[in-house]
Interface confidence: medium
């Protein structure tokens, strides 16, 4: 709305940088062939690029990424009883970000 | 995969708490009747609850919220020239989070 301007602080742009985000660990990251198990923990923190750039035709993108393997529990339920196994999930952390020009493919004439 | 266990650190649950997120300021928050304008800044930071809880039937939810009005620029394009106006957008920040039981409606028998 255009009302109550006095109390409002000027909005500050969310700059393009890494922020902590929550990544849900889906079961198919661990085993696509079997659904009879649970994963713990169900979510972890990752570093991801987010925010806006000063220009319309640029986008906030990761300029440097790092793969980070983490161990999770794969809890298989066999005859109503759990069997705990370790599984490795590889997470992607963004280490650095940049405002990158969006390349729109030109129509072929 | 179940391989390369040695190099992987145990995964740590992303606890239920407030984290900084990026909120895109959409034009219809400012004016639903007119599309012939731009908003600056296009995105801002907000505090939001995210993460996982220790239990299956609970969800990470905001237990305390605060409305925060911010001033943005509404840039109208009139005859190819920009006209700058001020507008207020009210953002929602989460101040505190809790793991709340998911109430699943029981089927009526």
């Amino acid at each position: 709305s255009l009302g109550s301007l006095a109390a409002a602080e000027p909005a500050v742009i969310a700059e393009c940088k890494t922020r902590t985000e929550v990544f849900q660990i889906s079961r198919n990251l661990i085993d696509r062939t079997n659904a009879n198990f649970l994963v713990w923990p169900p979510c972890v923190e990752v570093q991801r690029c987010s925010g806006c750039c000063n220009n319309r035709n640029v986008q906030c993108r990761a300029s440097q990424v790092q793969m980070r393997p983490v161990q999770v529990r794969k809890i298989e339920i066999v005859r109503k009883k759990p069997i705990f196994k370790k599984a490795t999930v590889t997470l992607e952390d963004h280490l650095a970000c940049k405002c990158e020009t969006i390349v729109t493919p030109r129509p072929v004439t | 995969s179940l391989g390369s266990l040695a190099a992987a650190e145990p995964a740590v649950i992303a606890e239920c708490k407030t984290r900084t997120e990026v909120f895109q300021i959409s034009r219809n928050l400012i004016d639903r009747t007119n599309a012939n304008f731009l908003v600056w800044p296009p995105c801002v930071e907000v505090q939001r609850c995210s993460g996982c809880c220790n239990n299956r039937n609970v969800q990470c939810r905001a237990s305390q919220v605060q409305m925060r009005p911010v001033q943005v620029r509404k840039i109208e394009i009139v005859r190819k020239k920009p006209i700058f106006k001020k507008a207020t957008v009210t953002l929602e920040d989460h101040l505190a989070c809790k793991c709340e039981t998911i109430v699943t409606p029981r089927p009526v028998t």
Partner: antibody, heavy 120, light 107 residues
Framework: EVQLVESGGGLVQPGGSLRLSCAAS????????MSWVRQAPGKGLEWVSY????????YYADSVKGRFTISRDNSKNTLYLQMNSLRAEDTAVYYC?????????????WGQGTLVTVSS | SYELTQPPSVSVAPGQTARISCSGD??????VHWYQQKPGQAPVLVIY???NRPSGIPERFSGSNSGNTATLTISGTQAEDEADYYC?????????FGGGTKLTVLQ
């Protein structure tokens, strides 16, 4: 204060029965799996039994299977261990302990224990 | 049934590093936890999921687990660390404890 308090221990004759209770306070009991662990005098720790947060999963050490029954009453924030056909080798301090997750995991909170003595 | 084997005793001079081992078949495939127990007291969790330290546990406590052996390491051992230490792993449907290791801090 987050705590577990066991009760119900005592002297019982071989073949007899006892029911141990564990009262939980200071946390949402219904969100946690629980276990009983025992320790014979001068010996090491021995896991006895486990129950999931909602009571749907229960399992037991081979040494007590068929004789002991674990249960819980989430409305009363209480864990139980019904011990039947007691033997001399069941003499131990019995601890109730909390798992941090609904499925189990480490034992992050322990009670102070209650002594069970099986002797004629 | 699955067994975890620990040395009955380990001695260390104050300020030195103590290492307590726990071995079991393919133990590296399971998450190992370590508990400290002082005389007349209930056990206390000092390491969980191989290498994680609960809040309130000093940084000198650390853990590792690979192959057939998990290790609890206490760096700069202090007199107050003298206690029994138990490893534990949840394997097929049961929580298994090692036999325990008595850590003596030499005076």
């Amino acid at each position: 204060e987050v705590q577990l308090v066991e009760s119900g221990g005592g002297l019982v004759q071989p073949g007899g029965s006892l029911r141990l209770s564990c009262a939980a306070s200071g946390f949402t009991f219904s969100s946690y799996a629980m276990s009983w662990v025992r320790q014979a005098p001068g010996k090491g720790l021995e896991w006895v039994s486990y129950i999931s947060d909602d009571g749907s999963l229960k399992y037991y050490a081979d040494s007590v299977k068929g004789r002991f029954t674990i249960s819980r009453d989430n409305s009363k924030n209480t864990l139980y261990l019904q011990m039947n056909s007691l033997r001399a080798e069941d003499t131990a301090v019995y601890y109730c302990a909390r798992h941090p997750y609904w499925y189990g995991g480490q034992l992050d909170l322990w009670g102070q224990g209650t002594l069970v003595t099986v002797s004629s | 049934s699955y067994e975890l084997t620990q040395p009955p005793s380990v001695s260390v001079a104050p300020g030195q590093t103590a290492r307590i081992s726990c071995s079991g078949d393919s133990l590296g495939s399971y998450f190992v936890h370590w508990y400290q127990q002082k005389p007349g007291q209930a056990p206390v969790l000092v390491i969980y999921d191989d290498s994680n330290r609960p809040s309130g546990i000093p940084e000198r406590f650390s853990g590792s687990n690979s192959g057939n052996t998990a290790t609890l390491t206490i760096s700069g051992t202090q007199a107050e660390d003298e206690a029994d230490y138990y490893c534990s792993a949840f394997t097929h449907n049961s929580d298994v404890f090692g036999g325990g290791t008595k850590l003596t801090v030499l005076q």
